[in-house]
Amino acid sequence: APRGTQAEESPFVGNPGNITGARGLTGTLRCQLQVQGEPPEVHWLRDGQILELADSTQTQVPLGEDEQDDWIVVSQLRITSLQLSDTGQYQCLVFLGHQTFVSQPGYVGLEGLPYFLEEPEDRTVAANTPFNLSCQAQGPPEPVDLLWLQDAVPLATAPGHGPQRSLHVPGLNKTSSFSCEAHNAKGVTTSRTATITVLPQQPRNLHLVSRQPTELEVAWTPGLSGIYPLTHCTLQAVLSDDGMGIQAGEPDPPEEPLTSQASVPPHQLRLGSLHPHTPYHIRVACTSSQGPSSWTHWLPVETPEGVPLGPPENISATRNGSQAFVHWQEPRAPLQGTLLGYRLAYQGQDTPEVLMDIGLRQEVTLELQGDGSVSNLTVCVAAYTAAGDGPWSLPVPLEAWRPGQAQPVHQLVKEPSTPAFSWPWW
């Protein structure tokens, strides 16, 4: 009968040895068998399970010239870069005839310096703000003790007494380094050193101090910045996209923001070159030598209405008997708000001035008293918003109307030197 077919007679003449080493070690397990007839395929088991993707090589050497003679079969299993998952009991397995043979076991063990599964990471934190750091190490051999160090100084006096996997830091006032050390029966391993950069706290209480049609004055309260003085604060303003685009805490706005820097103190800034009667959102961040704070939430603000910056255009005034017909066009200059209407003033040489509110119409017919004998009649027009009257037009003399003639047009040449302002309610 072929060698190895009887249950009591194992074909194995060499069994796997033992390997114990540190992570990353490369080693080889070897088993040898002697069989009669065709050499079988050698399988490797780890903890009783066949290794499907084993890095193994099989060498077969005939001991005679006849293929029914004995063969020596050597199988080598290579373990590259030893890991915890490689540890366990290893055996060779062969199928001979209707029987299965398994070698004596060899053992692969892992034993070395602690290995970090998790190390502290670099991060930025606001001054005096609590945060956590994580560190995790394993053997074997176990147990593994951890020690946290801040700026190379141990944070506890005894293993088991200090924090282990998670370190809670109640707050820092200066940029610091943290690392952890892991110790087992093989020695000590040191983690990477994490740099925790202390940034200023987010400013608080961003608010409006005063408003003008094209400028806003804002102020805020700075947050703590640790041992690092604030160097400046940065304010951003953005058009509010119909008031819909930016909610509190929402990410960056769609438009390119208007950015201004304020030297500090004082924690106050005048934002100019804004559009009147326009909603904006503003936010602020403050910077130290370590970097910038986080931005405040977007604060909705609005510039107030202003008065129109120019008088109505193309005013014409013609007279026909006791009636005067006046018409004009909207000012070309910015209105700085919502146009509410026009005021008209007319005056004769020896008569008092008459003021009229025309509303939003751009023409008016005046009923002149008497038979129209008022001489040298002149008309002025001004546009107004909720903020008050814009500048008055230059006086336009009343022209006599002759049928068939075009009505004369008087171009506005220059503004009056002292336009009348009506200040808003705030």
Epitope: P141, P143, A156, A158, P159, K186, G187, V188
Partner: antibody, heavy 118, light 107 residues
Framework: DVQLQESGPDLVKPSQSLSLTCTVT?????????WHWIRQFPGNKLEWMGY???????NYNPSLKSRISITRDTSKNQFFLQLNSVTTEDTATYYC???????????WGQGTSVTVSS | DVQITQSPSYLAASPGETITINCRAS??????LAWYQEKPGKTNKLLIY???TLQSGIPSRFSGSGSGTDFTLTISSLEPEDFAMYYC?????????FGGGTKLEIK
Amino acid sequence: DVQLQESGPDLVKPSQSLSLTCTVTGYSITSAYSWHWIRQFPGNKLEWMGYIHYSGSTNYNPSLKSRISITRDTSKNQFFLQLNSVTTEDTATYYCARSLWFYAMDYWGQGTSVTVSS
Amino acid sequence: DVQITQSPSYLAASPGETITINCRASKSISKYLAWYQEKPGKTNKLLIYSGSTLQSGIPSRFSGSGSGTDFTLTISSLEPEDFAMYYCQQHNEYPWTFGGGTKLEIK
């Protein structure tokens, strides 16, 4: 204050076992730290022998591994050294100590002198 | 095992002087070297660990430096009570090993 005190025989015959006790006061050996045995040979050479960790696990110097055993009695707050098959080469002053973390030994006993001789 | 070579083995100095003791490791031990003081009738005293960390309660005239393989203990402005035996010990890996010692005597 933490104190460690070694005790045991002054004289041991070759091939016998050397047994020493370290009694700790002022700190529980199960709370933290590792608890060590060190010896100093005539001529001042120091040798670290091994420790028992507060968890109960042990770690020995490979040069002594086949002969050394460190155990403890937590109820008495004591830990023990047993060194088997001693020879005259084991004549030394034996110290017990506590390690500061895994850095170094921050508390030592006074030491006990043991002579191996027939 | 890591071999530790300590030098000098003997040193004579006067109070007020500054002295240095050196230890060299046979391979890198990172920063993990400790220094001890031994005096007759007293328990051994830990002075420095992790190369340069001063143990609590030790006067600041003791300082340690070095990393890798070369380390130094410096005692500045020697006091009469500093004359003793000094040892270094690596605590980077087991088995922990010690230097051969330096005897500091009054000149």
